[in-house]
Interface confidence: medium
């Protein structure tokens, strides 16, 4: 591993038992105090996106070899670090492989690909919610509920770059019934497949389903933003959508370049570079503070492309909520 840290035994390189390298030797990390902030830093270091869990390292096969050492007793990250090596660490004094730390990241490698041609979610609000349709021999087909599972929904959401599946096993409302041929039923996905077409299924077009059994899937909302509290859509307190929840953005490091990206993304012209006082007239937000230390070059098309701390990690209050005023 180029970085001296790796995840071993997972379904992909972004999950598994945590192993670090010291003096040419790979060893494990004890899970004393191991939490989501430590995983967030590790995921960032590995280029694996956001942290999604802190599973036990013993879940991953093959287990650590007996002669392999536990190299670190505890790691304590604040979440601001770029690498595990920057986090406070304690030398081993009492730990066995039963306590090996594990980590699970969102693995962005599968979610940055362009929207594939072979599957879509139709008639929904945006491309991440809707009726499942699959393309076969240049024809779009619906998918029957029979045999459909959360694992299949996970595959679709991942294939579309839409994050996690948040709703499945839902039949379409009448207005969203398909009018296409019904493709197949008895989908049997493991959840690990790269595409829905890789899942075993019943034969093409041979089923007894009706369109009232068409499958509807909703994936985690993609990134979105809005300006609230202003006179129009191009001015106000900035809010971003993450995991289906709107939250504010902290003004640490916020400046002209960040303003410009927001205005550009909203199609609101250029930033009017408001004064500190003008920015504060929209008042503080409530609820989640999603982003802190946002850093843009100004070239980005979306705020999502700018650097920032791990989602939800901040040292701010709502008094520091960002507001943006664009030319419209």
């Amino acid at each position: 591993s180029p970085s001296g840290v790796r995840l071993v035994g997972g379904l992909h390189r972004c999950e598994g038992r945590v192993e670090v390298e010291q003096k040419g030797q790979w060893g494990t990390v004890c899970d004393d105090g191991w939490d989501i902030k430590d995983v967030a830093v590790l995921c960032r270091e590995l280029g694996c996106g956001a942290a999604s869990g802190t599973p036990s390292g013993i879940l991953y096969e093959p287990p650590a070899e007996k002669e392999q050492k536990v190299l670190i007793q505890s790691v304590s990250c604040t979440g601001t670090e770029d690498t595990l090596a920057q986090c406070e660490q304690e030398e081993v004094y009492d730990c066995s492989h039963d306590e090996d730390a594990g980590a699970s990241c969102e693995n962005p490698e599968s979610s940055f690909s362009p929207v594939p041609e072979g599957v879509r979610l139709a008639d929904g609000p945006g491309h991440c919610k809707g009726r499942v349709e699959v393309k076969h021999q240049n024809q779009w087909y619906t998918v029957c509920q029979t045999g459909w599972s959360l694992r299949a929904a996970k595959v679709v959401c991942r294939q579309l770059g839409c994050g996690r599946a948040v709703l499945t096993q839902k039949r379409c409302n009448k207005h969203a019934y398909g009018r296409k041929p019904i493709w197949l039923s008895q989908m049997s996905c493991s959840g690990r497949e790269a595409t829905l077409q890789d899942c075993p299924s019943g034969p093409w077009g041979k089923n007894t389903c009706n369109h009232d059994e068409d499958t509807w899937v909703e994936c985690e909302d993609p990134f979105d933003l809005r300006l609230v509290g202003g006179d129009n859509l191009c001015s106000g307190r900035l809010e971003v959508l993450h995991k289906g929840v709107w939250g504010s953005v902290c003004d640490d490091n916020w400046g002209e370049k960040e303003d410009q990206v927001v205005c550009k993304q909203l199609g609101c012209g250029k930033s009017l570079s408001p004064s500190f006082r003008d920015r504060k007239c929209y008042g503080p937000g409530v609820g989640r503070i999603w982003l802190d230390n946002v850093r843009c070059s100004g070239e980005e098309q979306s705020l999502e492309q700018c650097q920032h701390r791990f989602w939800g990690f901040h040292d701010c209050t709502h008094q520091e909520d960002v507001a943006v005023i664009c030319s419209g």
Epitope: P2, G4, S76, G79, T80, Q86
Partner: antibody, heavy 113, light 107 residues
Framework: QSVEESGGRLVTPGTPLTLTCTVS????????MNWVRQAPGKGLEWIGL?????TTHYASWVNGRFTISKTSTTVTLKMTSLTAADTATYFC??????????WGQGTLVTISS | ELVLTQTPASVSEPVGGTVTIKCQAS??????LVWYQQKPGQPPKLLIY???NLESGVPSRFKGSGSGTEYTLTISGVQCADAATYYC?????????FGGGTEVEIK
């Protein structure tokens, strides 16, 4: 966001000296902070750091002569048993990179009899 | 104790040329290696973090690479403004270490 060092001055060998690093725009409960020094015409030399938790670690050459501590908005470096070899510009720096690397302008410490 | 050996100690290159600075660690390190540029009378300025990530606002002619014990900073198409001293620095277990520095002169 900024860091600013103060307290550097001319002192005689053996005189203790305390340098202060004042931070603004971010919280010391989220970042580790480093002290680094640079003798005239020489390279950068790491002195030590204080983690968000308050735990401190030092370069092996420090040998207990320096102590780092912090309050909610300041990080201090207490120096004892100073000699001419400790003459340098002392920098305070935040230990994070992707969130914006921050260094102060430095404060000059001169040890001379 | 971890030691970072930086080579060469100094280099002179004409405008438009390429400068390569190497940083070798005495043992395998995390990619928590960063590169700084320092000009006289100023604090160091971050160029590269995580061995290869370009800091925001830094020109793309600066490139960091490497893994394990060997790391490199390459400046392609050097300009007069690049005359400075460059340092590598890494984070180890509860410690931070600097390389000795490389002085870059532009002819």
């Amino acid at each position: 966001q900024s860091v600013e060092e103060s307290g550097g001055r001319l002192v005689t060998p053996g005189t203790p000296l305390t340098l202060t690093c004042t931070v603004s725009g971010f919280s010391l409960s989220s970042y580790a902070m480093n002290w680094v020094r640079q003798a005239p015409g020489k390279g950068l030399e790491w002195i030590g750091l204080i983690y968000a938790s308050g735990t401190t670690h030092y370069a092996s050459w420090v040998n207990g002569r320096f102590t780092i501590s912090k309050t909610s908005t300041t990080v201090t470096l207490k120096m004892t048993s100073l000699t001419a070899a400790d003459t340098a510009t002392y920098f305070c720096a935040r230990d994070s990179y992707s969130t914006g690397n921050l260094w102060g302008q430095g404060t000059l410490v001169t040890i001379s009899s | 104790e971890l030691v970072l050996t930086q080579t060469p100690a100094s280099v002179s290159e004409p405008v438009g040329g390429t400068v390569t600075i190497k940083c070798q660690a005495s043992q395998s390190i995390y990619s928590s290696l960063v590169w700084y540029q320092q000009k006289p009378g100023q604090p160091p300025k971050l160029l590269i973090y995580g061995a290869s990530n370009l800091e925001s606002g830094v020109p793309s002619r600066f490139k960091g690479s490497g893994s394990g014990t060997e790391y490199t900073l390459t400046i392609s198409g050097v300009q007069c403004a690049d005359a400075a001293t460059y340092y590598c620095q890494c984070s180890g277990y509860n410690s931070r270490v600097f390389g000795g520095g490389t002085e870059v002169e532009i002819k």
